[in-house]
């Protein structure tokens, strides 16, 4: 495949990414695919700046993100590593709620209104960011 | 790689408390909750309760409650639980295990309940 | 708070055996059943969660299935090592309960 060395339309270059922001609901799982059909996975947040880019356009409502405990620990999708990553938890989170009766805890991690991050039910239908990175290889066959 | 590890085993006089300790390494220890599960010997494995180690809330079996405490320190990355008015059926082993989906266990702590 | 109920409480079987576990939930846990296999003097090990997804670095010999009340765990083809005790549990709704426990004999 051809490297992408721009933007598809209606994506956000920021940072030698490129952010697709939904402007409807999605289960996380639903979320997930998505972005992977769009040779994207949903957005990976690895430093304090890229969190301000991502905060500033998803404005103050939940949205999800690309990290969730679904197998055990917790990890990004792209397999950055959660431990020695960067995190923005909100105070008390994760906590694995079980008192919302839906069954089961809260795997999957989302943006909330004030852009730090809480653990939620993976089926809830929030919008959500996809991101690819530029320097990536397309999917693409390159044109002759 | 991801640890949890236990205090040693202890013997007890009916009426006291016992105190076990659960000190994880190998992961950031607020992303998990900490969970107690017992086992007296030969038997079953029965389930105390759980300890968010962010906020410190917790959640106890209603058996246990009022008998139970589970705290922690955040600066040593280790859970704690306490048992108190002990009496030999208390005696068992205890486990602390991550998540309640337990991917990780202690090895194990044996309390003995006896005069 | 939701009973489990695990069957048989002990079986003999062979080396190179299919064996199959059964756990019963006295009410709908939708997915959320997972097992686990103790060895003596040993902690519990998660063999498989969520209904039949394998925990990392468990042979897939083990596998999972069901949904809402019935589910079984399968040992397709027994090795020595698997002459232990199997436990199933629920984390579908709090408190956290755990099915009685069989024990795979050697007949």
């Known amino acids: 495949g051809s490297e992408r060395t721009c933007c598809p339309v209606n994506w956000v270059e920021h940072e030698r990414s490129c952010y697709w922001f939904s402007r409807s609901g999605k289960a996380w799982a639903d979320a997930d695919n998505y972005c992977r059909l769009e040779d994207a996975h949903l957005v990976v947040v690895t430093s304090w700046e890229e969190q301000k880019f991502v905060q500033h356009h998803i404005g103050p409502v939940n949205t999800w993100m690309g990290l969730h405990d679904q197998n055990g620990p917790w990890k990004w999708v792209d397999g950055t590593d959660y431990e020695t990553g960067f995190k923005n938890w909100r105070p008390e989170q994760p906590d694995d709620w079980y008192g919302h009766g839906l069954g089961g805890g809260e795997d999957c991690a989302h943006f909330t209104d004030d852009g730090r991050w809480n653990d939620d039910v993976c089926q809830r239908p929030y919008r959500w960011v996809c991101e690819t990175e530029l320097d990536k290889a397309s999917q693409e066959p390159p044109l002759l | 790689q991801v640890q949890l590890v236990q205090s040693g085993a202890e013997v007890k006089k009916p009426g006291a408390s016992v105190k076990v300790s659960c000190k994880a390494s190998?992961?950031?220890?607020?992303?998990?909750?900490i969970n107690w599960v017992r086992q007296a010997t030969g038997q079953g494995l029965e389930w105390m309760g759980w300890?968010?180690?962010?906020?410190?809330?917790?959640g106890y079996v209603q058996k246990f409650q009022g008998r139970v405490t589970m705290t922690r320190n955040t600066s040593i990355s280790t859970a704690y639980m306490e048992l108190s008015s002990l009496r030999s059926e208390d005696t068992a082993v205890y486990y602390c295990?991550?998540?309640?989906?337990?991917?990780?266990w202690g090895q194990g702590t044996l309390v003995t309940v006896s005069s | 708070d939701i009973q489990l109920t695990q069957s048989p409480s002990s079986l003999s079987a062979s080396v190179g055996d299919r064996v199959t576990i059964t756990c019963r939930a006295s009410?709908?846990?939708?997915?959320?059943l997972n097992w686990y296999q103790q060895k003596p003097g040993k902690a519990p090990e998660l063999l498989i969660y969520?209904?039949?997804n394998l925990q990392s670095g468990v042979p897939s010999r083990f596998s999972g299935s069901g949904s809402g009340t019935d589910f079984t765990l399968t040992i397709s083809t027994l090795q020595p090592e698997d002459f232990v005790t199997y436990y199933c549990?629920?984390?579908?709704?709090?408190?956290?309960?755990f099915g009685g426990g069989t024990k795979v004999e050697i007949k």
């Open positions: 549990q629920q984390s579908y709704s709090l408190p956290v309960t």
């Open positions: 969520a209904t039949s």
């Open positions: 190998g992961y950031t220890f607020t992303s998990y909750d």
């Open positions: 295990a991550r998540k309640k989906t337990g991917d990780y």
């Open positions: 009410q709908s846990i939708s997915k959320y």
């Open positions: 300890m968010n180690p962010n906020s410190g809330n917790t």
